[in-house]
Amino acid sequence: VEIYTSRVLEAVNGTDARLKCTFSSFAPVGDALTVTWNFRPLDGGPEQFVFYYHIDPFQPMSGRFKDRVSWDGNPERYDASILLWKLQFDDNGTYTCQVKNPPDVDGVIGEIRLSVVHTVRFSEIHFL
């Protein structure tokens, strides 16, 4: 599996962000596809579960991401993206996207470095 992500993402505190992860695979996409999202905080604390998809989306039942994450992917379009709502400053860190599409289960895990900021930079306003 080959992963494509937005790599670096900057978003404003209190807003929602789409964590984009798409993939390619030598195998046809089917019901065996799984997507796992995890989070590594900036402070180096333990990795935390964010989201899991296998036929249906499975949201975390507890923890920081409970009721704050939803599936925004589409397997037919090779899209494994998620939406993270109501961003907080302690959401800063690295989000990892792992896609397995048996028999294609190897490959690099995609990473997105999320920076939650007070306000968007002028250069980004200019190009929106």
Epitope: E2, Y4, T5, S6, R7, K20, T22, F23, S24, S25, P28, V29, E76, R77, Y78, D79, A80, E124, F127, L128
Partner: antibody, heavy 119, light 108 residues
């Protein structure tokens, strides 16, 4: 060897519809999506729409009301139909395979079919 | 829609030269940027996908780079067959995917 070949009418009357068939070989339409792109005389490339491996479609919003893409997997053919053609729809129409899946690059293209809209 | 701008519409170079073709997006496209070559007969070929990944069969003298809104295609040691028109295309948001206006590379 991956190949795509468009076949179209060449000349279309204004207000009439355009039908183009893209016949593919060297890969299966159950595994890869197919895009349609056009190039007007002396102009750049314009993405029109895509049909994915499972049969769902996405269209350029500028054409959604008059564009339809379908396919027959068993015949390895993709069908493009655009209604209500006008002179500014004169262009070369290409079909292209969606390669690299979620990289969304068009990795192999047909040679294109020239369409002139004129009475 | 995301606008893709190739500010240089034509470029002259000599055999053996190294040339860089630029492309700018109207917003961050997260490296979802592809490069195509179109020959005068209309034939279109993919060169680079996802900013810097070389499509199979494409010579290594082609390379891509960039991030956020600014991207470039570099051709080192130009060969006769490289004189063509080059288009960038963003595939970050769908629909629609959009192309740059093209840069025609001509022999000096």
């Amino acid at each position: 060897e991956v190949q795509l070949k468009e076949s179209g009418p060449g000349l279309v009357q204004p207000s009439q519809s355009l039908s183009i068939t893209c016949t593919v070989s060297g890969f299966s339409l159950t595994r890869y999506g197919v895009h349609w792109v056009r190039q007007s005389p002396g102009k750049g490339l314009e993405w029109l729409g895509v049909i994915w491996s499972g049969g769902s479609t996405d269209y350029n919003a500028a054409f959604i009301s008059r564009l339809s893409i379908s396919k027959d997997n068993s015949k390895s053919q993709v069908f493009f139909k655009m209604n209500s053609l006008q002179a500014n729809d004169t262009a070369i129409y290409y079909c292209a395979r969606n390669g690299y899946d979620g990289g969304y690059a068009m990795d192999y293209w047909g040679q294109g079919t020239s369409v002139t809209v004129s009475s | 829609d995301i606008q893709m701008t190739q500010t240089t519409s034509s470029l002259s170079a000599s055999l053996g030269d190294r040339v860089t073709i630029s492309c700018r997006a109207s917003q961050d496209i997260s490296n979802y940027l592809n490069w195509y070559q179109q020959k005068p007969d209309g034939t279109v070929k993919l060169l680079i996908y996802y900013t810097s990944r070389l499509h199979s069969g494409v010579p290594s003298r082609f390379s891509g780079s960039g991030s956020r809104i600014d991207y470039s295609l570099t051709i080192s040691n130009l060969e006769q067959e490289d004189f063509a028109t080059y288009f960038c295309q963003q595939s970050d948001t769908l629909p629609p995917w959009t192309f740059g206006g093209g840069t025609k590379l001509e022999i000096k």
